[in-house]
Interface confidence: medium
Amino acid sequence: DFGLDCDEHSTESRCCRYPLTVDFEAFGWDWIIAPKRYKANYCSGECEFVFLQKYPHTHLVHQANPRGSAGPCCTPTKMSPINMLYFNGKEQIIYGKIPAMVVDRCGCS
């Protein structure tokens, strides 16, 4: 698997992973204790033809062009968890692994 990495200075228009730091305090999410902010990343850009398409199905659907189908979108194709310290529903503070919190790779799907 392959994905492009960009930054705020990139001129790349194709589907790319960009850095993004999420700040929970700025959201007012005080039930998250740590980390108060983390590197989440995000996907943005155009999906032309077969560029970075994760599944052959994506290309085939686009070719067949059934009614109501949209073109492929730039979306996470690989994500990873982070460890967080947070209040659970029972007012306990828990240290736990939360899945799919970080975008590791972007592609077209």
Partner: antibody
Amino acid sequence: QVQLVESGPGLVKPSETLSLTCTVYGGSISSGNYYWGWIRQPPGKGLEWIGTIYYSGSAYYNPSLKSRVTMSVDTSKNQFSLKLSSVTAADTAVYYCVRDYYDSSGHYYNWFDPWGQGTTVTVSS
Amino acid sequence: AIQMTQSPSSLSASVGDRVTITCRASQDIRHDLGWYQQKPGKAPKRLIYAASSLQSGVPSRFSGSGSGTEFTLTISSLQPEDFATYYCLQHNTYPWTFGQGTKVEIK
């Protein structure tokens, strides 16, 4: 290398408020990846976590002490403080300040490292 | 609060001995456990984090194992500087709690 140094009175009278300060040297207390805490150890006994505070002022306390504990941060002095009200002889202990580190990748957390050298507080009239 | 029970509370051993200290948690804490060494008049020093990872600068004779509710600190060959009190710490659920300590003395 970050160093933590506790300061405050060594003797407090029963029913009064114990006040301690921890000064952080060699690093900024405002760094977003660090949390600051207090741990105590009564003479000849084990360790008890008192609470932890973030530089923004968010604090989390041990429920067993919560009604008596207040922690605060003074970023201008690179210090954080502990106040423990209505003390009794059972609060006689060595009080340590500590640092926690939470990596913004969310993959590596480091509890209670480093520690201050500890300061002895005796509650007695 | 999660209770951490250490055993034994004290032990006597000789230089070169293999020493094992156990820590039991009152509920599942995954791998969220550290081991600390404390010498008289000094602040504790962390030896092991995440149940089995060796702190940088700590001799390899120290090792940790376990997960869930049962954990072990092993000193493979006790050295004169290892005579101290050892504490486990759970950091799975607030409040963080320590074991009551194991004092390792010279036989």
